[in-house]
Structures are given as structure tokens and as C-alpha cells.
Interface confidence: medium
């Protein structure tokens, strides 16, 4: 049989509000007192196996002892009542678990949602943590009928067990209860139809229009409780490579619909669309977004002509010259479709013209030494661009008017070029550039800028520590103006090698040093200056600085009959590099001098 305990602790299931005081009592049975020769003064209270200080304990009478705890904060404490039997052996009488926490707060922010095809889900904010087992019950009723309670598993939401009935108002509230109290939220009263979150629209399709290259037509299927609800839509779109969505104005999609035409789009551009829906009154919740669907607008004729330029090769026996017409492929945003070919028309006079259809981006033609007009248009399947027109003057005409104050400078990892326009109205500017090298020809790239531009950056893939020769040519209605050129670096570095110094002439007390300019491929920047370091085997090193325009320098005040070691360094804006060391010996006597 089970042994009877020697006494009891009251209360047997203590739950205390945190921060408050709490008193427990231990009552010993009479039989226990006699058996163990003890009374209440022999009681030892313990919390989590640690003795409670005597000052918290009060002996009420020979059978009863109390213990008081102030400002209880621990969530759970094992409280035991023990006796010292026969005055020395500690024996457990009884134990309880003391819990602490808070009564439930009044639940707030109660909201309900009816996900289409599912039961109603309500959510709330339970307030502060109670640290106690707390039951939350979602209650709901009509004016005349109660619905089954919904016992929350999580304490913050509950899905009811019954299907919602639309177009009848329902009252909903939450009750929260634990050992320290019971409280109800404010109730909310609503028609479940106003809390619907529709399933996303589906079968979204996108079609283009041959008539209009700026539109795409969307169609989709909406659910809306199987047609019970009228839904309005929210349509967003972006270009295929963009990350941000463009919003179709909501006022354009307010009426219930299953199709829409999106306007003001760019031709021959792939767009991605998504759509969501909500009850047309705006009550309830937006559906999740539909699966994305994409479509491409129809082609339109190219919106502008290509950049157009020419290069003249040496003339053939002075009778005619070979001219290479060059142009740039249009970017997609201006091509408005797949460029099929280019139409080039060359006119010598009103009566003599020749038309070429070219698939590439250059055409070489032979022209006499007369003035010609070349026009260029790009063609896609819809039509041709406007024509770019270039006047190719006679080679006997001297180009007048150039840009002035031409400058180039690196900024933000780009190479910028700026200039002051010539005094005569310009049609456009041509910028040409290439890497200067002694090992390879200067392979030119080029770009065209509008007449209004006088500052731009080079749009090719430029390399660091390479010297670029940049040429700017204004183009007038009558033909190209004069060209202005300069050199520039995207980013300078220290030279790849220093100068190799040699002696040009050596005297008793002076020496003329000479060196060659560092090849442009090794300069890595603008050579700003040189330093010449020279010393004897025992003497102090001397350094002189020489301007970069020099290729020789005279060392003076040298000692006769002495070995000198010389080294030169070249400096760009980014640092210097030493050349090889060179030695020479001054003669003992000057020329014509004898011992």
C-alpha cells in the first residue's frame, strides 16, 4: 500500500502572479509528530533543493509552519516541506510545483480572413506572454445561433470548423483564460463575404497586335467563389530584365473584367505580367499574385537612323577614291525589331545615284573626287528608319572649323571627353579612339553624339594603363569639319620599365647622359619627369630631377678617374620605375691635359 505522507502543503497547486508575494503552509499530521518526535519548528523549507532562509519562515503552532516569498519572478519552483527527524535526519514531508506568470491580456487586433475554398481563419494579438498554460477560444454567433467554439492551438489564430455563410453578419470574439484570470476581446461584427481572399487569377495569357506595336492584350480566368463575387484586378508588368514592377493605374481596372489591354509599351520588347484580384468593393483581401506570363510587343519601324560615318582610303591614280561607309547597329530600344538590312543611297548629283542593300554595318564604295551625299536607313519587317545623311566632300576641299578646348579625363571608371563647339551650327559630332602602340596598328572605335552634346564618355570597353588617342570631329551639313586629337588614359600606372641610360660624352669632371623615351606600350601613363641617381662606390648617392621633355642631361662637378654608377627612373602620376644600372669612369686627365 502507498505510504501516507507525513503532512501537506497548502495550496497544493500554487500559481502566483509575477512580482507579487506568496505564502505557503505546511501542516504536519499528529501521528507524524509523535513518531518522529518533532513539531513544526523542525520543518525545513526548500526551493529547488536549496534551504529557504529562516527569516522567511514562521512557526504558526506545533503542527503548522508557513513560508513567504516576496516579488516572485522564477517561472517554476520546486517547493518542498522537510523535517529533521529525531532532530537530525532530514526527511521530505511534501512537495509542490509553484508556477508564476501573468493573467491573460485582453486580445486585440482581431481579424478574420476567408481564403477562398477554405474555412474562416481568425487571428489576434494575445498581448504579453503569460508564462502559464492559457487557453484561447474563438467564439462566434449569429444573432440567433451560436457556432462551435474554436480552440486555438497556437494562441494567436484559429480556423473554424464550419463553412462560412455569406451575406449574413457574424459576431466573433476571443476568450483567454488561465489560472490567474479570464478575459474577452472586443467582438467584431462582419459579413464573411467582406473578408474573402480570392484564389489567384489563372490561365493568364498575353498576345500582341500587328496594328499597334505599343500594346499587349491580357486575358485570364477569375474565380470569385465560382462567380458569386465580382472582382476587380491589379495588374503589374516589367520588362524581362527589370527587377521593379510598373503598376497599371488601379482606377483603370476597377470594373470586373477578365481581359485588359496594356498601352504605352515599347515596340519589340518582352514584358512579364502578373495579376491579382479583390472583391470589387475593395473589401476583403487581395489574392496572391497569379503565375507570371510574358509576351513581346510587335515590331515597329526603327525609331532613328544608325550612327553613320565614313573613312577615305588613298585615291587610285587620282581618278577616284575608295570610301568605307561605316555605321553602328541600332540598340534594341531603337531598332524596334530585327534589323533585316540597311539601305545606302549614294548621290553624286541629282541625276546620278546608286542604291545598295547591305546586311552588315559597312560598305566600301569607289567615288570620284566630286562631292557626294550618302544616306543610310535601317529596315526591319515593318519599315525603314528615317535616313541619316552624310555629305562626303571633294578631297580638294579643306575642312574648316574644329572643336576647341578639347579635354579628356577619367572619372568613375569612365573616360570623359569634353570640348567647346565650333562657331558654326553642327549636325553631329564623331568621336574616334584607339590604343596607341608601337607593336600593333591603331584599331579605331568610334561613336556619334548629337549636336547638343559637348561632354560625353567613350562607350567602348577601355583598358587601364593604355594610351588612347582620341579624335573629335564636328560634322556639318556640308561635311566634316577639322579634327582635333589628344591622348588620355582611363587609369595610369607606374611605367612597366625605366629608361636605359648611356653616356654620350664623358669628360674629366662631367658626363653627358642620354636615353630614349620609353616606348608608349611601357609608359602606362603620362611620363611627368625623370630622376637620375648617381654615386661612386664609396660616396653618397646624388639625385637630380629632369623634365620629361629631355632626352639628355649633363652631370657636372664629377671627380676625375672615378667609377660612377648611374640609374634613371621615370614617373607617371601613379609612381615610378627604375631602369637598369649603368657604370662609367671619368678620365684622369682632360683632353690635351698631361701629367
Amino acid at each position: 500500500q502507498l505510504l501516507e505522507p507525513c503532512g501537506y502543503i497548502y495550496p497544493e497547486f500554487p500559481v502566483v502572479q509575477r512580482g507579487s508575494n506568496f505564502t505557503a503552509i505546511c501542516v504536519l499530521k499528529e501521528a507524524c509528530l509523535q513518531h518522529y518526535y518533532v513539531n513544526a519548528s523542525y520543518i525545513v523549507w526548500k526551493t529547488n533543493h536549496a534551504a529557504v532562509p529562516r527569516e522567511q519562515v514562521t512557526v504558526i503552532n506545533r503542527t503548522t509552519s508557513s513560508v513567504t516569498f516576496t516579488d516572485v519572478v522564477l517561472p517554476s519552483v520546486q517547493l518542498t516541506c522537510n523535517i529533521l527527524s529525531f532532530g537530525q535526519i532530514e526527511q521530505n514531508v511534501y512537495g509542490v510545483t509553484m508556477l508564476s506568470g501573468f493573467p491573460p491580456d485582453k486580445p486585440t487586433n482581431l481579424t478574420c480572413i476567408v481564403n477562398e475554398g477554405k474555412n474562416m481563419l481568425c487571428q489576434w494579438d494575445p498581448g504579453r506572454e503569460t508564462y502559464l498554460e492559457t487557453n484561447y477560444t474563438l467564439k462566434s454567433e449569429w444573432a440567433t445561433e451560436k457556432f462551435p467554439d474554436c480552440q486555438s492551438k497556437h494562441g494567436t489564430s484559429c480556423m473554424v470548423s464550419y463553412m462560412p455563410t455569406y451575406y449574413v453578419n457574424i459576431e466573433v470574439w476571443v476568450e483567454a483564460e488561465n489560472a490567474l484570470g479570464k478575459v474577452s476581446s472586443e467582438s467584431i461584427n462582419f459579413d464573411p463575404v467582406d473578408k474573402v481572399k480570392p484564389t489567384p487569377p489563372y490561365n493568364l495569357s498575353v498576345t500582341n497586335s500587328e496594328e499597334l506595336s505599343s500594346i499587349l492584350k491580357l486575358s485570364w480566368v477569375s474565380s470569385g467563389l465560382g462567380g458569386l463575387l465580382d472582382l476587380k484586378s491589379d495588374i503589374q508588368y516589367r520588362t524581362k530584365d527589370a527587377s521593379t514592377w510598373i503598376q497599371v493605374p488601379l482606377e483603370d481596372t476597377m470594373s470586373p473584367r477578365t481581359s485588359f489591354t496594356v498601352q504605352d509599351l515599347k515596340p519589340f520588347t518582352e514584358y512579364v505580367f502578373r495579376i491579382r484580384s479583390i472583391k470589387d468593393s475593395g473589401k476583403g483581401y487581395w489574392s496572391d499574385w497569379s503565375e507570371e506570363a510574358s509576351g513581346t510587343t510587335y515590331e515597329d519601324r526603327p525609331s532613328r537612323p544608325p550612327s553613320f560615318w565614313y573613312k577615305t582610303n588613298p585615291s587610285h591614280g587620282q581618278e577616284y577614291r575608295s570610301v568605307r561607309l561605316i555605321w553602328k547597329a541600332l540598340p534594341l530600344s531603337e531598332a524596334n525589331g530585327k534589323i533585316l538590312d540597311y539601305e545606302v543611297i549614294l548621290t553624286q548629283s541629282k541625276s546620278v545615284s546608286q542604291t545598295y542593300t547591305v546586311t552588315g554595318t559597312e560598305l566600301t564604295v569607289n567615288l570620284t573626287n566630286d562631292r557626294y551625299v550618302a544616306s543610310l536607313a535601317a529596315r526591319n519587317k515593318v519599315g525603314k528608319s528615317a535616313a541619316a545623311v552624310l555629305t562626303i566632300p571633294s578631297p580638294h576641299v579643306t575642312a574648316a572649323y574644329s572643336v576647341v578646348n578639347l579635354k579628356a579625363f577619367p572619372k568613375d571608371n569612365l573616360l570623359w571627353v569634353e570640348w567647346t563647339p565650333p562657331p558654326k551650327p553642327v549636325s553631329k559630332y564623331i568621336l574616334e579612339w584607339c590604343v596607341l602602340s608601337e607593336n600593333a596598328p591603331c584599331v579605331e572605335d568610334w561613336q556619334q553624339e548629337d549636336a547638343t552634346v559637348n561632354r560625353t564618355h567613350l562607350r567602348g570597353r577601355l583598358l587601364e594603363s593604355k594610351c588612347y588617342q582620341i579624335t573629335v570631329t564636328p560634322v556639318f551639313a556640308t561635311g566634316p569639319g577639322g579634327s582635333e586629337s589628344l591622348k588620355a588614359y582611363l587609369k595610369q600606372a607606374a611605367p612597366a620599365r625605366g629608361p636605359t641610360v648611356r653616356t654620350k660624352k664623358v669628360g674629366k669632371n662631367e658626363a653627358v647622359l642620354a636615353w630614349d623615351q620609353i616606348p608608349v606600350d611601357d609608359q602606362n601613363g603620362f611620363i611627368r619627369n625623370y630622376s637620375i641617381s648617381y654615386r661612386t662606390s664609396v660616396g653618397k648617392e646624388m639625385v637630380v630631377h629632369v623634365d620629361s621633355s629631355h632626352t639628355e642631361y649633363t652631370l657636372s662637378s664629377l671627380s676625375s678617374d672615378t667609377l660612377y654608377m648611374v640609374r634613371m627612373a621615370a614617373y607617371t602620376d601613379e609612381g615610378g620605375k627604375d631602369g637598369p644600372e649603368f657604370t662609367f669612369t671619368t678620365p684622369k686627365f682632360a683632353q690635351g691635359e698631361i701629367e
Epitope: 553624286q348 541625276s351 546620278v352 545615284s353 564604295v365 570620284t368
Partner: nanobody
């Protein structure tokens, strides 16, 4: 490579007719003019007629205007010279030529880069 092959030459009585043909092949670069030239022994080669392959405009030397007609077929790889009312002074070696120069001087021989071997035309009394 570019080749021009003339045919149709021969001997004919004064006042008679001949039709010369010239087939051009291997031309990757579009020609602008096709021309007929003739050379009499001891004299410089002179322009007779030329046709623009782009617009079909025709130019004739004053000495053959109204008697000779230059034409091309639809595929533009053959050019013809129809010669009527032939005179003794029309005798000579007739050459077909192709030019890539855009010009109004279409019977200037210096502007033609490609030449055929020639076909002999002899007019007798």
C-alpha cells in the same frame, strides 16, 4: 575572281547589224556601271555606251547616238550592245567593262576596274 566574257562580234556589211553580249561572273562587289568600249589599231580606247546597273540610266558617245542601244537583262549579269546602221568607222575591238565608281562620267575608261578580252567587229563596204 571577276570575269567578263564578250561574244557576238564578227564581220558585217556597212548598214548591217550586230548584237554583242557580255556576261559578268564572280562579282562579289556590286558594280555601278557596265560599259562598252572600242579600240581601233593605233588609237586610244574610247567609250561607246554605258548603263547604270542601279537605275538603268544610259549614256552614249555622240558618234553612236541613235544607232546603238545598250541594255541589261533582269538578272543584271548580262549586258548587250545592239548595233544598227553600222559604218566603216565602227570597225575595231569591242571591250566590255565593269565599274564600281559612282559617277556621271560613265564612259570615262579610267573609272573602270574590270575588263573583258574583247570581241572583234569588222564593217566592210
Amino acid at each position: 575572281q571577276v570575269q567578263l566574257q564578250e561574244s557576238g562580234g564578227g564581220s558585217v556589211q556597212a548598214g548591217g547589224s550586230l548584237r554583242l553580249s557580255c556576261v559578268i561572273s564572280g562579282f562579289t562587289y556590286r558594280q555601278t556601271f557596265m560599259g562598252w568600249f572600242r579600240q581601233v589599231v593605233g588609237k586610244e580606247r574610247e567609250g561607246v555606251a554605258a548603263i547604270s546597273t542601279g537605275g538603268g540610266s544610259m549614256v552614249y558617245a555622240d558618234s553612236v547616238k541613235g544607232r546603238f542601244t545598250i541594255s541589261q537583262d533582269s538578272s543584271k549579269d548580262t549586258v548587250y550592245l545592239e548595233m544598227n546602221g553600222l559604218k566603216l568607222e565602227d570597225t575595231g575591238m569591242y571591250y566590255c567593262a565593269a565599274s564600281t565608281v559612282i559617277t556621271s562620267e560613265s564612259i570615262n575608261r579610267n573609272l573602270y576596274q574590270y575588263w573583258g578580252q574583247g570581241t572583234q567587229v569588222t564593217v566592210s563596204s
